[in-house]
Every structure is written in C-alpha cells, then in structure tokens.
C-alpha cells in the first residue's frame, strides 16, 4: 500500500468543505525520485493539491475542496505512471443534510389488530442513511411525567409508520409518542403527541342493508328508500354516530351528506330523493361523544327509490267514426303538474254502468296516446287515468256530447317559416273554454289516424303556432273546434302551405301556324303538383336577330298566344315563364324563323 | 362510586312473571350498554342479554329469547328484565352490569335470586 | 355461535406460587377477551379486559396475554386473597359467551 488518504470527515452538510491529505511512503518512490501527487473527484481532476516532502521521506499532498456539492462521490490520489493515471487511494464522501423535524404525527387504534399505528411526514431528503424510531412511554398524567418506556417501535426501511402491538398498549391510559429521525449529521425529533389510544380508535363501518319489505309494513313512500346497517360487532358497544352519503347512480350530482344518525338504527327511511332513481349509499362512524377517529365509507349499497303516481293533467279529444258512430277515437296528451311528474307505463280508459256500484269496466289500457273503442250505448262519459307502478293519475273525466256550442269565424293560416304555421280566428261569443287544434296532410294525402292536435287552454286565444310536423311544400289541412262546458262547437276547417315550390318546369311551347309577320305559339299546361302553388301567370318572351327582346304577360289559364309585328324573313328566339307565388321557372327555347314576303302563309 | 342495585327477585311459579330491576347511580347511565347475566346455584357465569344505550339494540341468548325482555329507562338510571313464562332452569342469581366500550362487564351488582318453583 | 374453553377446570396451589389459567376459544375473537375473579356469594369482578388490559385497582401480579384464539390468565405470585373461581368471556360478538371456569384452591 503505497498512499494512504485522510480525510478532515467523510461526511459533511452539502455544500461544506472538506480537506484531505495524501501520503506517500519512501518505499514508493521508486517509482519517480520526485513524484507528483494528483488529485481526482469522481472522474474530475482538481487542482489546488499542496505537495510538500516531510522529514521522513514522505511524500504528502493537501487539498481543500472549497464545496462539496455531491452527495457522494470518490475522492482519489494518484500518480501519473507512464501515460496512464495510478490510483495510491481513495475514500468515499457523502454530503447532504441533518434530519428534519419529522412532522405530522398522527396515530390509529386498530381494534381489530389490536395495534396502535402511527405515522409521519419524514421530512425533505437527507441524501444519507436516516433511521426513525417511534419513542413512546407510559403516563399516568397528561404526559407531564413519564412511566415505564415502551420498546421502540422501527420501521421497514422506507416506511413512515409503524405500528406498537397490543402487549406494549395500555388502553385509557395516556402515552407519550414521538418520533426520532438520525443521521451522521444530527438527531431530530417531532412533537410529542399525548394520547390514550382508545381516543384515536378508528372503526369499521358498519354494513348497510335494505330493509326486507314485510307484509304489515307500509311501502316506503315515493323518493324514499327504507334501509338499515348493521354495526361492526367489535365495535357495537363503542357509542358512535354515524352519517350517510348519497348520490343518483347516474349523472354527474355530488355526495349529498345526512347526519348525524344513531348507530344502532334497526331501520331508516331516507326520504327527499328522486323516485324511481338509482342511488349508491354509504355509511362511516366515529367515536362519539368520545373522541375517535372516522372509519371508512362502507362498501356501497345500490338501491332504487320508488316511484310516484303520474302527477299529469291529460288533455283529451275524440272523434266518432263516420260510419259507426259508437266507435270512437280516444286522443289524449299527458301535461306534467310537476317538475317529477312521474313515470307513465300506460293508460287505462273506463266506464262505470249506472246503478253497478264499484263496478268498473276497461275499455282498453295502451301505451299509446290514443285508443278506439266501442261507447256502450248507454254511455255518455268515460274516464282516463295514466298508471304505473305506484297508482294511478287523477281520472279525467271525457263526455261525449253533441256540437251545441257557436262556431269560430274568420279561421285563416300563413306561413311563418318553412316549419311552422300560424293559425288565426275570431273567437266566439260567449269565450269558449279552450280550442283544439288538428293538423295533417290535406288532400290528396289526408288521413284521420295521422293528424298531430294540440290544446289551447285559454279560450281567448285568437291564434296558435303549429310548430310540430310542419314540413317545406306540403298542403295542410288543420281544423280547429272551440271547447265548451259540456259541449264543443262546429269544427271549421283551413289549407295551408308552409313554404311553397317553384313550378318545376314550364311548359314546352309548339308552333301551331305561322305566317310573314306573325306566328302563333301554344301549349299543355303542366298538371298541378302537390305542395306546389298554382301559377299565377305566364310571361312569353322573344328576341330577334338583334337581340331586342319583347315580353307579354298572360294569366294562367292561357293556352296559346299570337306573336304579332314580326319581321319577315326573320329568326326568332321565344321562351315561356310559368309564375308562381313561389317562383318562376322558363321553358325550353323555341327557335322559328318569319316567312318570306314571297311565300305563302303556313297554316 | 359506581353502584348497582337489583331487586325484584323471588319465588315464582313455573310459567309465571317477574320483573327484575336495576338501579344505577355513580356514571352517567345514558351512555353505557348494560347487560345482566345470571348464575345458577353451583354452576358457571351465563350471559342472558345486553341493551345498548338509547334501547335500540337488545340481543338475547337463546336460552331466553323470546320470553325475556330487556329495557331501560335513562331518564330513571333504571334496566329492567321481564321475565315471562319461567322454567325451573331459569332459576338462579341475576346480576345487573354495566359493560365497556369493548363489551367487557366492568361493575357487576350485588346479584338478585329467582327461584322457579312448583 | 363461539364457545370459550377452559383449563383447568380446578387446581390447587400454594401461596407465592406463579399460576397459569388458559382459554381457548372455538374460533378467533382477535383482543376481545376477558377474565373475572368471583369469590363464593359475592359478584364477578373484572381483572382484565382486551385480552391484557389491567383494570383499575387490579393488583399487577394479574396479568393477561394471548390473540386470535388462545389466551392466558397468569397469577405471578398467588396471594391467599387470590383464591377463588376465574371466568374468561369473549365480547367480540353476542351471543356473549363465558368459559366454564377453573377454581384456584389452596394447596
């Protein structure tokens, strides 16, 4: 061994300096009369080595590395021997920083485990080997005077907790808890915690069940959910209060909290919920009125609230068939009373006989929103209620009476845009209690079982938007009937497009004769198109060799036309236009050329 | 000082009723499960029934179950134990306890003897 | 339902001897036992409770120690107030059940 390296401390606070030295035996020198003595960090040489020989023949050399900033690194001496580097020595130097206070210490009684766990921040990084240790003690007091030392309790390596079994516990007695973070380069320690473990004890939560429905017992009421839990045995004789969490199974609502709730509820209704709704439910209890810590949510439990009976007014009309006027045809349009209205699953029309109390007869359950069936002959009234699992809506009573009411006057329509149409009237006198308003397809594509209808509560409304199956160029019939006590009136009746077509072609224009200054033109008007407006007029256009135009308007129902103060011998471009309130669309061009003054007129 | 004192105790007939009762002084009653176990003449210690602190919660052994009835009144720092169709195995001394948090009988009462008997 | 089993049933020992009294329960009741001491025509007393919990004013020659299923009661140096019939209870869950009992009686 040739060199030796001493070192002023092989570990320092980050960023001190250090100071080492490196000697070389007399017997090394062999090796060269005056060697040179190098220093290397890492791989890095470093200048600033003293080198000096001592009285025994020695060769030593002294560094200061002003700043350790590694926090660990080689530090070598050596000689340069032939062209490459001898390493005499080497040490390892570590650099980093003294413990900080460990903070954040907070303990859990684990009945289960029987283990009181504690843990800890550490604090920032060291950069060199740290151990913790959790220090604890028995007290009697609060602390103040300590008793017997409980074994320290070591953590794995790289834990932040640890746990002090049962044997070394003593519940309802106070312990004195802290922890001490060491290292090369100090010692720290947290704040003493002071507690009796029973004070920190952490539960399980108990486990919510649904409530078995039993036969005597109500059912719960519409958004309510009936539930019980069943404490943690262990923990059953601990008092505690509990609190539940809950949220619709669906969208995006967040917990909403209700407490606190005794531990031993043997059942709970939770009402105020959604009906007919998914919720996920969980429970967590403390200690209380003692302190303790919460236990965890428990495993959730899905239950669904029932549902309510439809809260909906239901606007109804109907119409007798022609043929058979005991056959009617039931409409009906359900109208929320509520924001939850409730679910519908169907409808059910009925009919009680005078004189069989209770007996009621179905004549028919759909869901649909229309029904037909047979009226009993004696029948003047049914009933309709909208049903689902929960009951039924209240009945809306549906007389059948004949058209006694005054008729509506002045009924007209008009477009407003390609969807919608805007039906207007001169109410009655007296007011009528509301209208309803039918719309369908009108000749040639009308049908009954296809119309959309609306009800207008306020009798004096003098106008209604249609607004729902209102398409471009289609003719719409659309009825409107005045609603009364006990009766209706007249159902009047008006056709609307609301947006109309161009036509889409004009007709083909034929020379029938045609003479030296004249020429007589005609043509097969196009049939008419549904959903296009009938023409208004027609233009006639010509234009000669000089490209002069001429034009004449004639009404639609023309069939031909004479062009008149043609020159002879001439050519003559002609074109029709056929208009309507929708547009105008030309024909094909016809080119014909005026006879010579010799010839003779072509008939 | 924590006590417990039970009466109510007596000679009853096969198939009759008594009423034992337990009054409490020295804690706060309204905060502690209570229990009674009973022990018959020469025999070991046997658990009859525990009631939680507000009343909701009242297990049975089954040797007892469904002609016993344990209740309390806090607002009297009193347990009872209705006893009702009585056997002659019934027969033995009653203890009245208090139990802690974790389920252990703490305080015990001076014991209350029935006797079943024709 | 859990049944707590104990052993033994009775022994005999002398003043200062060191006794040792065991429990076994028919499946595991983690810390949640209990042992009693009662005297003829007197009441149960409490010793210890969580399996090695002393209870207030209990002398520290009791002590208790054991988990899951066995436990142990053990006496460090019997004194003669120390004759009388031990109890162990699970309190885990109901039904409540306690062991048979061992008598210490003097030697």
């Known amino acids: 061994e040739c060199g030796h390296i001493s070192v002023s401390a092989p570990i320092v606070h980050l960023g001190d300096p250090i100071t080492a030295s490196c000697i070389i035996k007399q017997n090394c020198s062999h090796l060269d009369p005056e060697p040179q003595i190098l220093w290397r960090l890492g791989a890095e040489l470093q200048p600033g080595g003293r080198q000096q020989r001592l009285s025994d023949g020695t060769q030593e050399s002294i560094i200061t590395l002003p700043h350790l900033n590694h926090t660990q690194a080689f530090l070598s001496c050596c000689l340069n021997w032939g062209n490459s580097l001898q390493i005499l020595d080497q040490v390892e130097l570590r650099a980093g920083y003294p413990p900080a206070i460990p903070h954040n210490l907070s303990c859990l009684m684990n009945l289960t485990t029987s283990s009181l766990i504690c843990q800890w921040e550490p604090g920032p990084e060291t950069h060199l080997p740290t151990s913790f240790t959790l220090k604890s003690f028995k007290s009697r007091g609060n602390c103040q005077t300590q008793g017997d030392s409980i074994l320290d309790c070591v953590p794995k390596d790289g834990q932040s907790h640890c746990c002090i079994p049962r044997k070394h516990l003593l519940l309802y007695q106070n312990m004195g808890i802290w922890v001490q973070a060491e290292n090369a380069l100090g010692t720290s320690m947290s704040p003493q915690l002071c507690l009796d473990p029973m004070d920190v004890v952490k539960l399980e939560p108990p486990m919510l069940r649904t409530m078995d429905p039993s036969p005597e017992a109500a059912p719960p009421q519409a958004g309510c959910l009936q539930l019980c839990w069943e404490p943690w045995q262990p923990g059953l004789h601990i008092n505690q209060k509990c609190e539940l969490r809950h949220k619709p199974q669906r969208g995006e609502a967040s917990w909403a909290l209700v407490g606190p709730l005794p531990l031993e509820a043997l059942q709970y209704e939770l009402c105020g919920l959604l009906p007919a709704t998914a919720y996920t439910l969980q429970i967590r209890c403390i200690r209380w009125p003692l302190p303790g810590h919460w236990s965890d949510w428990s495993p959730s439990l899905e239950l669904r609230t029932t549902e309510r009976a439809p809260t909906v007014r239901l606007d109804t009309w109907w119409r007798q068939r022609q043929l058979d006027p005991r056959t009617v045809q039931l409409f009906w349009k359900p109208v929320p009373l509520e924001e939850d209205s409730g679910r519908i699953q169907g409808y059910v029309v009925s009919w009680r006989p005078s004189g069989q109390a209770g007996a009621i007869l179905p004549l028919c359950n759909t869901t649909e929103l229309s029904c037909t069936f047979h009226l009993p002959s004696e029948a003047q009234e049914v009933a309709l209620v909208a049903y689902n699992s929960a009951g039924t809506s209240r009945p809306t009573p549906v007389v059948f009476s004949e058209s006694r009411g005054p008729a509506l006057t002045r009924l007209h329509a008009m477009a407003r845009d390609p969807h919608s149409l805007w039906v207007g009237w001169e109410p009655p006198n007296p007011w009528p209690q509301g209208y309803v308003i039918e719309w369908g397809l009108g000749p040639p594509s009308a049908s009954n079982s296809n119309k959309t209808w609306r009800m207008e509560q306020n009798g004096r409304a003098t106008g209604f938007l249609l607004k729902e199956n209102i398409r471009p160029f289609q003719l719409y019939e659309i009825i409107v009937t005045p609603l009364y006590q006990d009766t209706m009136g007249p159902s009047q009746h008006v056709y609307a497009y609301s947006q109309e077509m161009a036509p889409s072609h004009a007709p083909e224009l034929h020379l029938k004769h045609i003479g030296k200054t004249w020429a007589q033109l005609e043509w097969v008007p196009e049939p008419p198109e549904l959903g296009k407006s009938p023409l208004t007029h027609y233009t006639i256009f010509w234009t000669n060799a000089q490209n002069q135009s001429f034009s004449a308007i004639l009404n639609a129902s023309s069939r031909g036309f004479v062009l008149h103060g043609l020159e002879p011998a001439s050519l003559y471009h002609i074109h029709l236009m056929a208009a309507s309130q929708a547009g105008a669309t030309n024909s094909t061009v016809l080119t014909l050329m005026t006879l010579t003054p010799e010839g003779s007129e072509l008939h | 000082e924590v006590q417990l004192l039970e009466s109510g105790g007596g000679l009853v007939q096969p198939g009759g009723s008594l009423r034992l009762s337990c009054a409490a002084s020295?804690?706060?009653?309204?905060?502690?499960?209570m229990g009674w176990v009973r022990q018959a003449p020469g025999k070991g210690l046997e658990w009859v029934s525990s009631i939680s602190s507000s009343g909701g919660v009242t297990p049975y052994a089954d040797s007892v179950k469904g002609r016993f009835t344990i209740s309390r009144d806090n607002s009297k720092n009193t347990l009872y134990l209705q006893m009702n169709s009585l056997r002659a195995e019934d027969t033995a001394v009653y203890y009245c306890?208090?139990?802690?948090?974790?389920?252990?009988?703490?305080?015990w009462g001076q014991g209350t003897l029935v006797t079943v008997s024709s | 339902d859990i049944q707590m089993t104990q052993s033994p049933s009775s022994l005999s020992a002398s003043v200062g001897d060191r006794v040792t009294i065991t429990c076994r329960a028919s499946?595991?009741?983690?810390?949640?036992l209990n042992w009693y001491q009662q005297k003829p025509g007197k009441a149960p007393k409490l010793l210890i409770y969580y399996a090695s919990n002393l209870q207030n004013g209990v002398p520290s020659r009791f002590s208790g120690s054991g988990s899951g299923t066995d436990f142990t009661l053990t006496i460090s140096s019997l004194q003669p107030e120390d004759f009388a019939t031990y109890y162990c209870?699970?309190?885990?869950?109901?039904?409540?059940?306690f062991g048979g009992g061992t008598k210490v009686e003097i030697k």
């Open positions: 306890a208090k139990l802690g948090e974790l389920g252990q009988f703490m305080r």
């Open positions: 209870q699970q309190s885990i869950g109901y039904p409540g059940s």
């Open positions: 020295g804690f706060t009653f309204s905060l502690y499960w």
């Open positions: 499946q595991g009741i983690s810390s949640y």
